[in-house]
């Protein structure tokens, strides 16, 4: 009965963590001895290929400094406890501690057996490590120019992460790769850039790492954060201002980051009307009068700079009952 | 301990059999491939063939498969190997041994001179 | 079967010498060689497996290199005790089967 080597084709093990190479003989054939066991590393240099051996009496030797009897055990071999009893070598499962970058490559497990001669197996051993991923926004002031208003990184990962953005704003992303302070991991840094307007502020946008070691990709939130100048635009016309008409009222409605700093009322004509009142953002209208035939001008300040909205007026003589409306306030 | 103790020195005709001896003790006897290996005077070693005890199961170097034999009485914990149409090619110190890793463990040797 | 083909046959060398014998096989058996000290009268003692893994109680003066078909043994002190006879034997593949040996003679 033929006899053969069972490996796993790939393990995947964590940087500084711990894995198990398993290796074993099947099936159990009577008579069939098993007289060496020995781990070896094809593609190492000559003088770090031999990296374990199992002898039956003598028990397990590690030869290499790399990776060194202190970072490796054989999980299951157990040498013949004296002369009395066979040792147990079927297993020869291979534990690596202390996982570094240079543990990753092809490991072959061999039995030497009679009367079957050699049979071994091959297996390659994978060093991970999980990335520790942040997402943020940056503080951008509105500009003209394609700007970063959030970083996605992901540190220290092996392989490199796989960053991408989930957003329905008009954006491109900008990747760099650096080498992470632990040897063989590399820290990836996602920008997201785009043409920074008020558009874009308080939108919520979605990193997307994707990694090995990940169950599932990860997904960030973060909030974009523009900073822009107001913008503003005037409610509360209905076009049914009348002479005489007591109840209306201006909004100056503005969306801007930071928060407005100052309201200012005026008209083109240059003449206020004495029975509008200015009351920060809105404008009272105490009774409507001629003088409202003109263009009321709001002008609002933040941090960033200024907005302004226009709203012409028409002053009927009689109300408009035709398309009688609300009046804003 | 282990001992493997091989019966005496055998001085036999051409086209004659010889039965070499060895008596195991120290181990498990059922649990061991008894090897036999030969050295001719001032040359290398030669390996013969084999003997399982747990089921009496035999495996030969194809070059004596033809003469020889090799067996194993479980009950005297001993391992025979017996060479027949022997010829003067065929002096030679003979060896049991145990296989555990190497051949780790040997008898004193059996002197087998074939003279006519 | 496989031949082991060693060399050379007879090294003659002075204590505090470094020494080396070769075994080359004809076909590829992996590191699975052994290396065997035979003193005279005696039978074989392991000095080497796996093609460099030294044996429980021997000198760390002897030491094993080489995979695939060229493997050496080295003494990197001779002394006056290694006066012996060396094989090597491979047990990638049965049948096993040995060198012819190197006796090694003291100056």
């Known amino acids: 009965q033929d006899v053969r080597v069972q490996v796993l084709p790939e393990v995947r093990g964590q940087l500084g963590g711990t894995v198990e190479l398993p290796c074993h003989l099947l099936p159990p054939v009577p008579g069939l001895y098993i007289s060496l066991v020995t781990w070896q590393r094809p593609d190492a240099p000559a003088n770090h290929q031999n990296v374990a051996a199992f002898h039956p009496k003598m028990g397990p030797s590690f030869p290499s400094p790399k990776p060194g009897s202190e970072r490796l055990s054989f999980v299951s071999a157990k040498q013949s406890t004296g002369q009395d009893t066979e040792a147990e070598l079927q297993d020869a499962t291979l534990a690596l501690h202390g996982l570094t970058v240079e543990d990753e490559g092809n490991y072959t497990c061999e039995f030497a057996t009679f009367p079957k001669g050699s049979v071994r197996g091959m297996t390659w051993l994978r060093v991970i490590a999980k990335p520790k991923n942040q997402a943020e926004a940056q503080k951008v002031t509105f500009s003209q120019d394609p700007t970063t208003v959030a970083l996605c990184i992901s540190k220290e990962g092996r392989p490199p992460a796989r960053i991408s953005w989930l957003s329905s704003l008009d954006w491109e992303a900008k990747e760099t790769q650096v080498s992470g302070t632990l040897a063989g991991t590399v820290t990836v840094t996602s920008r997201f850039t785009l043409v920074p307007s008020g558009r874009a502020d308080g939108v919520t946008v979605t990193c997307k790492v994707e990694h090995e070691s990940f169950e599932e990709p990860a997904l960030i939130p973060v909030t974009l954060s523009v900073r822009y100048p107001p913008e503003v635009s005037i409610s509360g016309y209905d076009d049914n201002w009348y002479l005489g008409r007591t109840d209306a009222t201006l909004s100056c409605d503005v969306r801007s980051n930071p928060e407005p700093t100052g309201y200012d009322w005026s008209t083109t004509s240059g003449t206020f009307p004495t029975s509008a009142v200015a009351q920060g953002s809105q404008l009272v209208i105490h009774a409507v009068d001629s003088l409202f035939n003109t263009t009321f001008v709001c002008t609002v300040t933040n941090a960033v700079g200024m907005g302004r909205a226009e709203q012409v007026i028409f002053v009927r003589e009689t109300p408009n009952t035709a398309g009688a409306g609300a009046t804003g306030g | 301990q282990v001992q493997l103790v091989q019966s005496g020195a055998e001085v036999k005709k051409p086209g004659s059999s010889v039965k070499v001896s060895c008596k195991a003790s120290?181990?498990?006897?059922?649990?061991?491939?008894i090897h036999w290996v030969r050295q001719p005077p001032g040359k290398g070693l030669e390996w013969i063939g084999a003997?399982?005890?747990?089921?009496?199961?035999?495996n030969y170097n194809q070059k004596f498969k033809a003469r020889v034999t090799i067996t194993a009485v479980t009950s005297t914990s001993t391992a025979y190997m017996e060479l027949s149409s022997l010829r003067s090619e065929d002096t030679a110190v003979y060896y049991c041994?145990?296989?555990?890793?190497?051949?780790?463990?040997w008898g004193q040797g059996t002197t087998v001179t074939v003279s006519s | 079967d496989i031949q082991m083909t060693q060399s050379p046959s007879t090294l003659s060398a002075s204590v505090g010498d470094r020494v080396s014998v070769t075994c080359k096989a004809s076909q590829n058996v992996g590191i699975n060689v052994v290396w065997y000290q035979q003193k005279p009268g005696q039978p074989p003692k392991t000095l080497i497996y796996?093609?460099?893994y030294r044996y429980s109680g021997v000198p760390d003066r002897f030491s094993g290199s080489g995979s695939g078909t060229d493997f050496t043994l080295t003494i990197s002190s001779l002394q006056a005790e290694d006066l012996a006879e060396y094989f090597c034997?491979?047990?990638?593949?049965?049948?096993?089967?040995f060198g012819q040996g190197t006796k090694l003679e003291i100056k």
């Open positions: 120290g181990y498990i006897f059922t649990s061991y491939w």
């Open positions: 796996s093609a460099s």
């Open positions: 041994t145990k296989l555990v890793g190497t051949f780790d463990y």
């Open positions: 034997q491979q047990y990638n593949t049965n049948p096993f089967t």
């Open positions: 003997v399982y005890p747990g089921n009496s199961d035999s």
